[in-house]
């Protein structure tokens, strides 16, 4: 069944049912100018053509500009996540200008109407921002549109409608219905600012998809996949009210997209990085923990621009709340000798021992399937910084945790009853930080013991000689 | 001083209607959403819903959708609530209560409340 | 919607009294570190008149001896020093999401 969106039922009912009888609506979008960190304070009202306001309320001209653009909505209201992000950005750039685009009324319809406003709407910005430029020292270079779901899209619509070209625009889960696939001048593209990053975190290749699949800027960042959230589980969400639903989930991962953006305004110190990767499946197995050549960004506000030709895919893990920094690894196993394995894959964890910490047991997720005599590449990743690495304990899980794998193992007895004990020969895991883009490699305790088998576990140590490949010795990323 | 002056008490026969008025002063009246609550006699308080002051968009509970109408004349900084078709039932007291839209929009500003009386 | 159990639903204290009224709600009311839990008091014949927001500050000339606490779904309203003008009856409410819903109220009277 499609999923359900918002409290007040599915996004599909919403789409087609009639429009309530209401007061006459003034098509209207106001610029409210945040003059305080005080989220109470009403802050200052700004029009095109008055220019008392800007004067009243201290507009800064030689400053940045940030307007923050909301989505649909079915309260009518400002959502919570709106106030973070104007106190995020007034503590990260103190002489900011921070402007709430409000565009409620024009929000507050059946999805299909909403998503007919943006475009108005982002003539409205395009309008207040040509206005701006007419004064002296304004520059369109300073102009950053933050928009979300729905406000993405018109943030689009403004950088394509304004005279010139806006600094940046991030798009934070722009949503998908009406949008996925739709031609550059229908939605959020590259060429609507100088630099268009993009946060997506709720995308669904089954079912309805809130946010927008496809990307649409210079990076499109998909955190953990772009998909399923951590922390925004179910189980997660029944923890934190009394009855979980799946809107809660929903608003929880879309607006995940959010919390990242705050996350890097206000935790710079621990910036999250994204890596360049064709798809998520590829990211998972490991293969994309590359800095060279552009292929490593921070997330959020700290992103480096990236004008790339074409689209630029990038992944990251998170934690489940903030700071959501991790610390990815590549894991390289090479598998030279296997004995009786029979249809199950094996399943395997791994624990990281640092100079600075232990990781906790982490399991090894077999993507596709585990290769004999070749280089199998995993993805691990550790919420706490480990340090210099110091040794590996690799595990093979003995009992089979799932039905699945019992049943295979049972019809695998019946084929074979005297299947001898199942086997693998591991000398050296070769292991390369994504943050760092250090490499190391680790070999057995014991070089004659490189045997592990269900339910046993082999000790890894770093190697004597290291390990160093040509060209990718020195980390391209910096580190604060 | 900010204020929220509200229209007299009202005594009205079942199947009338009655208009109450909640008229602000002190604020820039479109910058604050105007609420309405109602009171039951011995009751407590009952969000009604809440009329964008900018936009004119109203926003009514469940319970409340139907006969009863907010409107607006901000040329005199002024919320109406009007209902319809009255019923002993609807014998309340009715506030207005002014509410930001930003921030955690609890209601800062009451008016002193209109006793709506419905009697045959 | 939210429902806010506001306990006791009356009580009975001499002034100098420490009194203490509970809102429990039946899910979180808070986003992040801030709570959109508030405490109004509405004294006979009047219009309630906001005391504490955001759980625990004390709106624009309501006297110290009022306070808030409490986060998620459990609140406290507190009178450290219970004076004769605090006879009222006084309610929670929450604004996290549309509706606004309050609690059924606590009234308050002196011994």
């Known amino acids: 069944s499609p999923v359900p969106f918002g409290p007040e039922g599915r996004l599909e009912d919403k789409l087609h049912k009639p429009k309530a009888t209401q007061t006459e609506v003034k098509p209207s979008v106001r610029f409210n100018l945040r003059t305080s960190k005080d989220p109470e304070h009403e802050g200052c009202y700004l029009s095109v053509g008055h220019s008392q306001p800007l004067e009243d309320c201290s507009f800064n001209m030689t400053a940045k500009t940030f307007f923050i653009i909301h989505g649909w909505t079915m309260s009518g209201i400002f959502e919570n996540w709106l106030h973070k992000l104007v106190s995020a950005l007034h503590t990260r750039e103190k002489d900011a200008n921070v402007v709430v685009v409000d565009w409620l009324p024009l929000a507050h319809q059946l999805y299909t109407d909403a998503v007919n406003n943006t475009r108005v709407v982002g003539h409205s910005i395009a309008r207040m921002l040509d206005w701006l430029q007419e004064k002296d020292d304004f520059s369109l270079g300073n102009v950053h549109l933050i928009g979300y779901s729905l406000g993405a899209h018109v943030a689009g619509y403004a950088g394509n409608f304004v005279k010139g070209t806006v600094g940046r625009i991030t798009g934070l889960d722009p949503a998908g219905p009406m949008f996925e696939g739709a031609d550059i001048h229908k939605r959020l593209s590259p060429d609507d600012a100088d630099f268009v990053d993009v946060l997506h975190t709720y995308t669904r290749s089954f079912g309805l998809s809130i946010g927008i699949q496809m990307p649409v800027g210079h990076i499109d960042i998909y955190p953990n996949g772009g998909d399923f959230q951590p922390g925004c589980g179910l189980n997660d969400v029944l923890g934190s009210i009394a009855y979980g639903t799946i809107t809660e989930v929903v608003k929880c991962e879309h607006e995940r997209a959010v919390h990242l953006f705050v996350d890097s305004l206000v935790n710079q110190d621990k910036p999250s990085f994204a890596f360049q990767c064709t798809d998520s499946n590829r990211f998972k197995k490991g293969i994309c923990l590359s800095c060279r050549k552009n292929r490593c960004n921070s997330i959020g506000y700290n992103a480096k621009k990236m004008r790339n030709k074409r689209n630029s895919k990038m992944y990251l893990k998170t934690r489940a709340g903030m700071p959501f920094r991790v610390y990815h690894y590549q894991m390289k196993i090479h598998v030279f000798s296997y004995k009786n394995m029979g249809e199950i894959e094996p399943t395997f964890y791994v624990t990281l021992y640092g100079t600075n910490a232990d990781s906790q047991t982490l399991p090894l997720e077999i993507v596709e399937r585990i290769e004999q005599n070749a280089t199998n590449t995993f993805l691990v990743y550790t919420e706490e910084d480990l340090g210099d690495l110091l040794k590996i304990q690799l595990t093979w899980e003995g009992a089979s945790q799932s039905w699945y794998n019992l049943w295979k193992e049972f019809r695998s007895y019946l084929s074979q009853p005297r299947n001898p004990g199942r086997e693998l020969n591991i000398r050296r895991i070769r292991v390369k930080s994504g943050e760092t883009q250090r490499k190391l490699t680790f070999c057995t305790e014991d070089p004659e013991n490189t045997s592990i088998s269900p339910g046993r576990e082999l000790w890894f140590r770093k190697c004597r000689d290291g390990w160093r490949m040509k060209n990718e010795t020195s980390p391209t990323v910096e580190l604060p | 001083q900010v204020q929220l002056v509200q229209s007299g008490s009202e005594l009205k026969k079942p199947g009338a209607s009655v208009k109450v008025s909640c008229k602000a002063s002190g604020y820039t009246f479109t910058n604050y959403g105007m609420n309405w609550v109602r009171q039951a006699p011995g009751q407590g308080l009952e969000w009604m819903g809440w009329?964008?002051?900018?936009?004119?968009?109203?926003t009514y509970a469940g319970d409340f959708k139907g006969r009863f109408v907010f409107s607006l004349d901000t040329s005199v900084s002024t919320a109406y609530l009007q209902i319809s078709s009255l019923k002993a039932e609807d014998t309340a007291v009715y506030y207005c209560?002014?509410?930001?839209?930003?921030?955690?929009?609890?209601?800062?500003?009451w008016g002193k409340g209109t006793t709506v009386t419905v009697s045959s | 919607d939210i429902q806010l159990t506001q306990s006791p639903s009356s009580l009975s204290a001499s002034v100098g009294d420490r009194v203490t009224i509970t809102c429990k709600a039946s899910?979180?009311?808070?986003?992040?570190?801030?709570?959109?839990m508030h405490w109004y008091q509405q004294k006979p014949g009047k219009a309630p008149k906001l005391l504490i927001y955001a759980a625990s500050n004390l709106a624009s000339g309501v006297p110290s001896r009022f306070s808030g606490s409490g986060s998620g779904t459990d609140f406290t309203f507190t009178i450290s020093s219970l004076q004769p003008e605090d006879i009222a009856t006084y309610y929670c409410?929450?604004?996290?999401?549309?509706?606004?819903?309050f609690g059924g109220g606590t009234k308050v009277e002196i011994k």
């Open positions: 409410q929450q604004t996290i999401e549309d509706p606004p819903t």
């Open positions: 899910q979180s009311v808070d986003y992040d570190v801030d709570s959109y």
């Open positions: 209560a002014r509410r930001g839209y930003y921030g955690r929009r609890y209601f800062d500003v």
């Open positions: 009329i964008n002051t900018y936009s004119g968009v109203p």
